[in-house]
Structure formats: structure tokens, C-alpha cells
């Protein structure tokens, strides 16, 4: 019997509320042995794959998807999925990225860490979805 793959998690650094023009990195985490992590957006067939997977702990692997300069169009719902041969995992919860006009100092709450366990997530929903073979070296900007 094939093992059941644990659902991945998704988080955002430095947080889920990002000033226009600033950077954000989505971090997808799953078990060890993951070959490909994929970052998806809700209601889209576009995605970003990476095989640049690192070991975050003895039992966990991760991949990072960076957007160097956030635009208004980057706002929305994101989720992760991974391929551990020969199976794909279920999708993570949604993480909502909010983009705001640049303002405020470094003490503003904009850098509060965000993750799929936070208040901005939405449960996965099997009626709307997306996939394909891995292509490396693409930043998350390719989702748009």
C-alpha cells in the first residue's frame, strides 16, 4: 500500500502584508524525499515549479519562491503542492498575500510572519485546481 503523503504547509517571509515594490518569499514545506515543490494561485492554471529543495530538519524539506518586487497583481491566494515520486501530495491551505502602498516605518505590523496556520488561510477545495513537469530556475513572477 502506498504511503499517505502529508499535506504541505505554506508561509510567507517577511509576512503576508507586503508594501508595493518590496520582496516576499513563499516557503513551502513537506516531508523529506520531495522532488518538486509547486506554488499555485487560486483559479489559475499557471504555476511555478522548483527542484531546488533543501532539508529544513531531519524530517522536513522546503523550497523557497521569491518575488523580488511585489506588484498589485501579486495579491491573492497561494498554495503549495509537492511531488514525491510516484505521487503528488494534497494541496496546502491557502495563504493570502496582501499588497499595500508603501508607507510606515519598520515597526509597522506588515512584517508579521504569515503561514497556512494563520488567519489568512482558506481550506483547500477540490473543485478548483492545477500541474505538469518540473521546470527549474523560474522565480514566482512567472505565475503572472
Amino acid at each position: 500500500q502506498e504511503e499517505d503523503l502529508p499535506r504541505p504547509s505554506i508561509s510567507a517571509e517577511p509576512g503576508t502584508v507586503i508594501p508595493l515594490g518590496s520582496h516576499v518569499t513563499f516557503v513551502c514545506r513537506g516531508p523529506v524525499g520531495v522532488q518538486t515543490f509547486r506554488l499555485e494561485r487560486d483559479s489559475r492554471s499557471t504555476y511555478n515549479d522548483t527542484e531546488d529543495v533543501s532539508q529544513a530538519s531531519p524530517s522536513e524539506s522546503e523550497a523557497r519562491f521569491r518575488i523580488d518586487s511585489v506588484r498589485e497583481g501579486n495579491a491573492g491566494l497561494y498554495r503549495c503542492i509537492y511531488y514525491k515520486p510516484p505521487k503528488w501530495s494534497e494541496q496546502s491551505d491557502y495563504l493570502e498575500l496582501l499588497v499595500k502602498e508603501s508607507s510606515g516605518g519598520p515597526d509597522s505590523p506588515d512584517t508579521e510572519p504569515g503561514s497556512s496556520a494563520g488567519p489568512t488561510q482558506r481550506p483547500s477545495d477540490n473543485s478548483h485546481n492545477e500541474h505538469a513537469p518540473a521546470s527549474q530556475g523560474l522565480k514566482a513572477e512567472h505565475l503572472y
Epitope: 492554471s45 504555476y47 505538469a132
Partner: antibody, heavy 117, light 110 residues
């Protein structure tokens, strides 16, 4: 690499039909597998796709009446409450080139479905 | 919902000529547009994806351009073998769509 559709034929209105797309040379679980149909003399119409562990998207008009499912080597399209408007050629197409599940780089030859009493 | 409008419905040009087909999206799709060629009795063939990238094995006589909502397919140095119907397809959204394809353009080569 190729895919071939099967299961088409003549069916009476109101009936149910399941088409099968059989892939060879590639693993369907690594790709977005789309169904597209074409009425005689008309344009292409996207039905939906499946990927990963049975995640699906459907065109608005296809929701509820069409269901896509898969195994490791086949993808099925189940169609219910069929009408004459569903007559046409049904294609299975592989998506995923260029980071989109809707870029369809490999198509089957199609299977003809005729709905008539 | 997202709709794709293709013009013209039909175009006729002589061998060696140039054909331009336009595709308009009802909302911005960035560069997520593909073009297909379909000949009678055959399945469609992917020509161009991401608006301007040539699919494997496709002649460089085919060119794509545009972004946002306006896109163009250009076929230069027309050959008899180019006679076919051409379709555009948005490749970004799979939620809340009626059809991802445009209505098609028939190209007749004289």
C-alpha cells in the same frame, strides 16, 4: 509519447457515456490532462482538466454534468444527460509546457460522439 | 468571466503573403496566450505559447506578439500547407471560464 481516446459512438439522448484517454510514453500524474471537444464544423471548446492527486477544473457550462477522473495511465471523461448539442469529436490533450496546464502540446486523434435517437 | 475574441473569422492570402490574426481577451492575461493550428480531420497543434514562444518543431515563419489583452499571430511567407484554422487560447485562468479558446480563424491560401 502519445495519447489515444476511446469510447465514442452513438448514444441516445439522456444517456451516459464514459470516454477514456490512454497515455503511452509518459505518466499522466505528472501532467495536466485536458478534455476538449469540437462540434461538427465548429470551434474548440475546453471542458476541463485533471492533475496531481485527482484535482479538477471545469468550464462553467460543464460543471455537474461532466466528470474527469484518472488512473496512472488513463484519464476518463464521464458525460451524463447527453443531448444532441453534445455531439462532436472529443480530444484528450496534455498540458504543462511553459508553466501552464492549459498549454496543450500533445493531442490524441479524438473520438467521435453522436447523440441521436 | 474571461472571454476570448478572435478576428477575422476568415482570411485569404496568396502564397508568399503574410497573414495577421488578432485575439482579444476580456481581461488581462499577461503573456499567458497560446496559438494552435488545426487542419481538417486532425487534432490541433500547438504553435506558440506564452504569447511569443515557438513550440518545438514549429517553423519560424510563425510569430506571436502581445500582452495584457491584445495579441497577434503572424504567418509570413505563406505556404499552401498553412491553410488551416487557427485558434488562440488563454492559458492563465481555469476558474470561472466558459471557454479558454477563441472562435477560430480560417486561413485560405490562394
Amino acid at each position: 509519447e502519445q495519447s489515444v481516446e476511446s469510447g465514442g459512438g452513438l448514444i441516445t439522448p439522456g444517456g451516459t457515456l464514459t470516454l477514456t484517454c490512454t497515455a503511452s510514453g509518459f505518466t499522466v500524474t505528472r501532467y495536466y490532462m485536458n478534455w476538449v471537444r469540437q462540434a461538427p464544423g465548429k470551434g474548440l471548446e475546453w471542458i476541463g482538466y485533471i492533475y496531481a492527486s485527482s484535482k479538477t477544473y471545469y468550464a462553467n457550462w460543464a460543471k455537474g454534468r461532466f466528470t474527469i477522473s484518472k488512473t496512472s495511465t488513463t484519464v476518463d471523461l464521464k458525460m451524463t444527460s447527453l443531448t444532441a448539442e453534445d455531439t462532436g469529436t472529443y480530444f484528450c490533450a496534455r498540458g504543462g509546457v511553459g508553466n501552464s496546464g492549459l498549454n496543450l502540446d500533445l493531442w490524441g486523434p479524438g473520438t467521435l460522439v453522436t447523440i441521436s435517437s | 468571466e474571461l472571454d476570448m475574441t478572435q478576428t477575422p473569422a476568415s482570411v485569404s492570402e496568396p502564397v508568399g503573403g503574410t497573414v495577421t490574426i488578432k485575439c482579444q481577451a476580456s481581461q488581462s492575461i499577461g503573456s499567458w496566450l497560446a496559438w494552435y493550428q488545426q487542419k481538417p480531420g486532425q487534432p490541433p497543434k500547438l504553435l506558440i505559447y506564452q504569447a511569443s514562444r515557438l513550440a518545438s518543431g514549429v517553423s519560424s515563419r510563425f510569430g506571436g506578439s502581445g500582452s495584457g489583452t491584445e495579441f497577434t499571430l503572424t504567418i509570413s511567407d505563406l505556404e499552401c500547407a498553412d491553410a488551416a484554422t487557427y485558434y488562440c487560447q488563454q492559458a492563465e485562468y481555469s476558474g470561472d471560464v466558459e471557454n479558454t479558446f477563441g472562435g477560430g480563424t480560417e486561413v485560405v491560401v490562394k
